[in-house]
Amino acid sequence: EINGSANYEMFIFHNGGVQILCKYPDIVQQFKMQLLKGGQILCDLTKTKGSGNTVSIKSLKFCHSQLSNNSVSFFLYNLDHSHANYYFCNLSIFDPPPFKVTLTGGYLHIYESQLCCQLK
């Protein structure tokens, strides 16, 4: 299911990098979140629960990431103009069932003031 544009601030700039915020419902217990740049998978994070509610976090394509109870943040560093693109949060929900996939995204604009290490 494609949801289209994120209805929240998806990009947060700091120190020449960007935090890309991928939100999900806090009812969701087990999921995979992928960050797509165009159609390419940049990062992913999978959260599963084992017996005794032990939480497991795995990444096949590792990026610096941060997990909360309703979002995954992926961090991109050393921004340059090539980072300008459409970025999508591709959420696959395993628990609660049934399995659902939802895609939200937005365009990352790169302005001179946000670039890393710009010449003064």
């Epitope: 949801n3 009812i27 609660p96 659902k100």
Partner: antibody, heavy 125, light 108 residues
Framework: EVRLVESGGGLVQPGGSLRLSCAAS????????MHWVRQVTGKGLEWVSA???????YYSDSVKGRFTISREDARNSLYLQMNSLRAGDTAVYYC???????????????????WGQGTTVTVAS | EVVLTQFPATLSLSPGERATLSCRAS??????LAWFQQKPGQAPRLLIY???NRATGIPARFSGSGSGTDFTLTISSLEPEDFAVYYC??????????FGPGTRLEIK
């Protein structure tokens, strides 16, 4: 008018098999998760099995390993293959559908808002 | 498995009276609760989803409330066609999806 029509019920001996079908019309079948719910005469409702829009399947413990749910979206059809039937499987079987929509941080569940009229399965020798 | 308990098992009231039906869950199901009405020989009909949202075509005299573990279905002024069996149902902690045992609403 939204319609679900079940068929395939009947009398079968213990250990036998039946295949139930459910034909849908007038709604977007492939956007619905579909379920089979059964009811013994004079008793309450019991969930049997479900299949998600992605084809993921779920079963109650009482039918796991004996029943198989499937769907054919191109034909707007839902099926329940019932094997190794027991007397305890005797009931009216309803097909029903519900929807879950995820929007950002929101998880919406809209309930089982479409139901068929039911088909009767009797397991007896 | 989430166990749903409904009470009373039977409720005897007259047309025009207010009916209050209760459903209790064995664990927190937030607001993911639905109510159904079933008449003899008919399939169940969805009345309420998300604990408090009326389904399409359901009269305003039906209302739902509650969250967590305690839920209520209220019929503000009973019509003759409202006498039936009412079931609550959860579909957030599953499988299995579970239904309550039902409350029979009968004419006094």
């Amino acid at each position: 008018e939204v319609r679900l029509v079940e068929s395939g019920g009947g009398l079968v001996q213990p250990g036998g098999s039946l295949r139930l079908s459910c034909a849908a019309s007038e709604f977007i079948f492939n956007s619905y998760d579909m379920h089979w719910v059964r009811q013994v005469t004079g008793k309450g409702l019991e969930w049997v099995s479900a299949i998600g829009t992605a084809g993921d399947t779920y079963y109650s413990d009482s039918v796991k390993g004996r029943f198989t749910i499937s769907r054919e979206d191109a034909r707007n059809s839902l099926y329940l293959q019932m094997n190794s039937l027991r007397a305890g499987d005797t009931a009216v079987y309803y097909c029903t559908g519900d929807r879950t929509v995820v929007r950002g941080v929101n998880y919406y569940y809209f309930g089982m808002d479409v139901w068929g009229q039911g088909t009767t399965v009797t397991v007896a020798s | 498995e989430v166990v749903l308990t409904q009470f009373p098992a039977t409720l005897s009231l007259s047309p025009g009276e207010r009916a209050t039906l209760s459903c209790r869950a064995s664990q927190n199901i937030r607001s993911y609760l639905a109510w159904f009405q079933q008449k003899p020989g008919q399939a169940p009909r969805l009345l309420i989803y998300g604990a408090s949202n009326r389904a399409t075509g359901i009269p305003a005299r039906f209302s739902g409330s509650g969250s967590g573990t305690d839920f209520t279905l209220t019929i503000s002024s009973l019509e003759p066609e409202d006498f039936a069996v009412y079931y609550c149902q959860q579909r957030i902690n599953w499988p299995p999806i579970t239904f309550g045992p039902g409350t029979r609403l009968e004419i006094k």
